[in-house]
Interface confidence: low
């Protein structure tokens, strides 16, 4: 059998096959060892004997999108039945006082590969025996600690396969400078030790993204706006967007980056250097926000030029050509031009991101003041309780609902949260009446809220003893 | 201790106006945070909340009385009243007077008036 | 409005026993986490009394045997003892919105 009639069922056509070589990935034309690792079929009754105690799942997790020419990192993550586990030597073991449906186990193993290699290397010192291979007949690399992997991963993609040992989680990354652009497909099998043999115990997929569109994620806050996540925003308060780049493997972080935004309210393009920028819109309404990310990326270096005439390029040409690397000697000559002919020299292009919301501005809570607290009366049955009136006072949108948060001087231990609807006038003026158990500092955080937009005040207060005998203390 | 007390004429003809009061003590109607409600129950029927006058004075009735209601306050006699015009068998009821604390609650009630509509 | 339902409509327990009562509304009376859900206590010819608010809260002065719980849209009230004095129809109210509404009652009787 060859690989890929064991790993997968599309076959890439020639062409992508060829052109999308990953480095250090081998063809599924090669052959696999099928007497050392077998291959069963989905629904073949073997595979509920394949592991002790119920099956093994196996995660495959990416983070894609990639930008091509990045690398793109895929984990495998083991999870194996209710109550077991990996331990420090590799071994499968039992946790202790965990009970499953078979109960509580006497043996602590599951699996004790410790004793098994032992038994099974003896015959030759190297410890390189015939079955310490891979399904293609390589040998296991010996990393220090390797007879503690016990796990045989076999990676497969356009047609080519990456083969690992490890433990109940891996991880390899693949550069995608060679990938075909567009949704692509990953699987992953995986064998566990048995003997002198291997056994699958987990076959899973994932579709992954190549793109030549930089991932831009943008997210926006306002102080004050209730919900962040319904690209509904305040009139007259300034919103902070925040381009986050997904480039989780620092693909670009040598690049320059530009910004240009367009809010959608003829003001303009305001182009940056800076992921954030703050932007007030002063009308209500519907806005369509724009957003364009141009970085000057690790990209192919374009075809050899027909011969430069004697005259020097512009410099907007050499710029466009300049090494990114830049620890690689610069050519000899001084027409940059003839970058392109070094052999692995890595030359830059332009790659860009796009990024568009519709946003709502509305009227909303703009600010809001304690402007009087006062000590109100208290009836005698209550004689350590205090009860304070604030007066405040709100500038923008009418509030609905009141919160107070009664915590401890530091304003970080919550004691007591009160919420509750309001009815204000246009004035915007209102007393919330809280109580205090006991006497001492407090930190009340009051909020004044509507449909949109939450505002928020501080202050300390201090509550001073009560005198038992003189429980009735008059408001102001 | 807060106090609320209703009065008013317990017999209303139909299509005439029911007019109530509830006195409140111990505590003034235009105290912050407090809203002051007019709630019915038919009898052996259960509750229904007419509506309030809040502490500022800003009125809200429920919907589907709204067109035949008004409640009203005097501040000087620490009052509120209750009219309901056009009223029918339909409004018979007890009507209780009660006080929205923080709006979260209705913790003190009046003892409840009966107003029965017949010719 | 919101609309409570209240079941069952009427409940016979013994002495001692454990009564339940269920409130539902027809939407969320959760605001800010907490439940605007108030339950109250009406015997025959007086006012109704404020036993639960905020869903779990205990009113001023109600018995310990007196609890509730619940969110969203699914509340309950528990009498872990039943007591003679507790004879009586017992009413759920949402605060969350106007107009504030009340279920249709539980009558709870002595088995």
């Known amino acids: 059998k060859r690989f890929h009639d064991v790993l997968g069922n599309e076959r890439p056509s020639a062409y992508m096959r060829e052109h999308n070589q990953l480095n250090g990935w081998s063809s599924d034309e090669n052959d696999w060892n099928e007497k050392l690792y077998p291959v069963w079929k989905r629904g073949d009754m073997r595979w509920k004997n394949s592991w002790k105690g119920g099956r093994v799942q196996a995660v495959l997790t990416s983070d894609s999108p990639a930008l091509v020419g990045s690398n793109i990192t895929f984990a495998v993550n083991l999870i194996f039945p209710r109550c077991q586990k990996e331990d420090a030597n590799g071994n499968i073991v039992y946790e202790k006082n965990c009970r499953n449906e078979a109960g509580l186990s006497a043996d602590p193993y599951v699996y004790n590969w410790t004793a098994w290699s032992e038994d099974s290397d003896g015959e030759n010192g190297t410890g390189q025996s015939h079955h310490n291979v891979f399904p293609d007949g390589k040998p296991f690399p010996h990393h220090p600690g390797w007879r503690r992997w016990n796990f045989i991963y076999v990676f497969h993609t356009l047609g080519q396969y990456f083969q690992k040992l490890g433990r109940c989680s891996v991880r390899v990354s693949v550069n995608t400078a060679n990938v075909t652009l567009g949704p692509q497909l990953m699987e992953v099998t995986v064998y566990r030790r048995h003997g002198r043999a291997y056994v699958p115990i987990a076959q899973v997929k994932d579709v992954y993204v190549v793109t030549d569109q930089i991932p831009v994620f943008v997210t926006m806050f306002q102080k004050n706006d209730r919900n962040s996540s319904d690209e509904t925003f305040l009139k007259d308060l300034p919103i902070m967007f925040d381009v986050l780049i997904h480039d989780p493997s620092h693909f670009l972080n040598y690049s320059t980056i530009n910004y240009k935004w367009s809010f959608g309210d003829n003001t303009g393009l305001f182009v940056s250097t800076n992921h954030t920028v703050n932007h007030t819109y002063v009308l209500n309404g519907t806005f369509s926000l724009n957003l364009t990310v141009k970085a000057a990326a690790p990209g192919p270096c374009p075809p050899p030029p027909p011969p430069p005439r004697p005259s020097k390029p512009t410099p907007s040409l050499a710029t466009t050509l300049k090494s990114y690397d830049s620890n690689t000697p610069g050519p000899a000559g001084d027409n940059p031009l003839e970058l392109s002919r070094i052999p692995d020299e890595n030359c830059q292009i332009n790659r860009y991101g796009h990024f568009q919301a519709t946003i709502t501005i509305v009227e909303g809570i703009l600010e809001v003041n304690i402007i009087q607290m006062t000590d109100v009366l208290m009836p005698v049955p209550w004689p350590e309780s205090s009860l304070i009136d604030f007066v405040v006072t709100c500038q923008g949108s009418i509030p609905t609902e009141v919160c107070t948060i009664i915590s401890d001087p530091t304003c970080e231990i919550t004691q007591n949260t009160v919420c509750s609807p309001v009815d204000v006038d246009e004035m915007c003026l209102l007393t919330v009446r809280r109580t205090f158990n006991g006497s001492g500092t407090y930190c009340v955080n009051l909020t004044l809220g509507d449909d949109t937009s939450l505002a928020l005040t501080s202050t300390l207060i201090s509550v001073p003893d009560r005198d038992p005998a003189s429980p009735l203390r008059m408001a102001n | 201790q807060v106090q609320l007390q209703e009065s008013g004429p317990g017999l209303v003809k139909p299509s005439e106006t029911l007019s109530l009061t509830c006195t409140v003590s111990?505590?003034?109607?235009?105290?912050?945070?407090?809203?002051w409600s007019w709630i019915r129950q038919p009898p052996g029927k259960g509750l229904e909340w007419i509506g309030y006058?809040?502490?500022?004075?800003?009125?809200t009735y429920n919907p589907s009385l709204k067109s035949r209601v008004t409640i009203t306050r005097d501040t000087s006699k620490n009052q509120f009243s209750l009219e309901l015009s056009s009223v029918t068998a339909a409004d018979t009821a007890v009507y209780y007077c009660a006080r929205d604390l923080t709006h979260w609650y209705f913790d003190v009630w009046g003892q409840g008036t009966l107003v029965t509509v017949s010719s | 409005d919101i609309v409570m339902t209240q079941s069952p409509d009427s409940l016979a327990v013994s002495l001692g026993e454990r009564a339940t009562i269920n409130c539902k509304s027809s939407e969320s009376v959760d605001y800010y986490g907490i439940g605007f859900l108030n339950w109250y206590q009406q015997k025959p010819g007086q006012p109704p009394k404020l036993l639960i608010y905020?869903?779990?809260t205990q009113g001023s002065g109600v018995p310990d045997r007196f609890s509730g719980s619940g969110s969203g849209t699914d509340f309950t009230l528990t009498i872990s003892s039943l007591q003679a004095e507790d004879v009586a129809v017992y009413y759920c109210?949402?605060?969350?919105?106007?107009?504030?509404?009340f279920g249709g009652g539980t009558k709870v009787e002595i088995k």
């Open positions: 111990g505590i003034s109607i235009t105290t912050g945070n407090y809203r």
């Open positions: 006058i809040y502490y500022s004075g800003t009125i």
């Open positions: 905020a869903a779990s």
């Open positions: 109210q949402q605060s969350k919105e106007v107009p504030p509404t």
